[in-house]
Amino acid sequence: RQQWELQGDRRCQSQLERANLRPCEQHLMQKIQRDEDSYGRDPYSPSQDPYSPSQDPDRRDPYSPSPYDRRGAGSSQHQERCCNELNEFENNQRCMCEALQQIMENQSDRLQGRQQEQQFKRELRNLPQQCGLRAPQRCDLEVESGGRDRY
């Protein structure tokens, strides 16, 4: 697989440099802040129930827009622009992963407390699906981690 990775890395690098992932960061930050507001949760509280409604992927914040579909109906401006940018990575799952990791790295300093960080990661992992795109099976979104290799 090395030759693919070398070719792919170069192509991916230029795609990442061209992409404007800022709308994705804004969309996700707005979403987790809106969730906190609508459920009256304290982002600093360490004793939050990890299965509270706003974190259940099957239950959405009633005030948030529906997941983006390609017609753009009812979606936020940030989300629509974000999906357009992510669409550039849809045929390269490694590059999609790198884009998600870049979003995580760019926002990690702005996330307040472990609770908010976990929520941001969860929303970030769901982002490709919200855009009607296929997500890689697993993206390591730990900002300072070497990850784990299975092989």
Epitope: N91, R134, Q137
Partner: antibody, heavy 126, light 107 residues
């Protein structure tokens, strides 16, 4: 040796339900995604659904979305495909297929369909 | 979705002849995500070529894959009796789709 065995096929009336099961052996089951692929009699191959290695990601083909449900039990090395509201055009041999995914640096990517079961025939007929 | 179109639909050849099967994608894909399968009557498909040009374990070297972008080719340099079967290309760059198949039959 990698082995995938499907069961549960049979004849069913339109609108009814049927469940298929795939039992895997010969590899570390919870490292691999599993797909279902079907083939109508005399026709080509059609991807149906997939469940990721940890069960966190599930996708369906548009033709079965909302009617079929894929799940896995890593403790039993099984993947199930629950098929509801069956239609005549669901008639096919259903194959359980291992995704030869590739993991690196904590990331795991979809891979080739490297091992297939022998298939289970589902016939939807009045 | 990416549509794969295989040609010809049927290829009638004699043992010992060279077979050239084509697979065209509706949009450009990395060769990493292109595979070829062989299917014989009453059997499950078998992985033949992955990454457009790599033979899977146990596949004889008379099978070879090539191509890039939107055009991919499977070549069987000299047909053996056991090679008469249906061949499918498949992509997994963007979801998962198969070509409609090419049947290689005895002339």
């Amino acid at each position: 040796q990698v082995h995938l065995v499907e069961s549960g096929g049979g004849v069913v009336q339109p609108g009814r339900s049927l469940g298929l099961s795939c039992v895997a052996s010969g590899f570390t089951f919870n490292y691999y995604a599993i797909h279902w692929v079907r083939q109508a009699p005399g026709k080509g191959l059609e991807w149906v659904a997939v469940v990721s290695f940890d069960g966190n990601i599930i996708y369906y083909a548009d033709s079965v979305k909302g009617r079929f449900n894929i799940s896995r039990d890593n403790s039993k090395n099984t993947v199930n495909l629950q098929m509801n509201s069956l239609r005549p055009d669901d008639t096919a041999v259903y194959y359980c297929v291992r995704d030869g995914e590739y993991c690196s640096g904590g990331n795991c990517y979809w891979g080739d369909f490297d091992h297939w079961g022998q298939g289970s025939l589902v016939t939807v007929s009045p | 979705e990416i549509v794969l179109t295989q040609s010809p639909a049927t290829l009638s050849l004699s043992p010992g002849e060279r077979a050239t099967l084509s697979c065209r994608a509706s949009q450009s894909i990395s060769s990493e995500y292109l595979t070829w399968f062989q299917q014989k009557p009453g059997q499950a498909p078998r992985l033949l070529i992955y990454g457009a040009f790599n033979r899977a374990t146990g596949i004889p070297d008379r099978f070879s894959g090539s191509g890039s972008g939107t055009d991919f080719t499977l070549t069987i340099s000299s047909l053996e009796p056991e090679d008469f079967a249906v061949y499918y290309c498949q992509q997994y760059a963007n979801w998962w789709t198969f070509g409609q198949g090419t049947k290689v039959e005895i002339k």
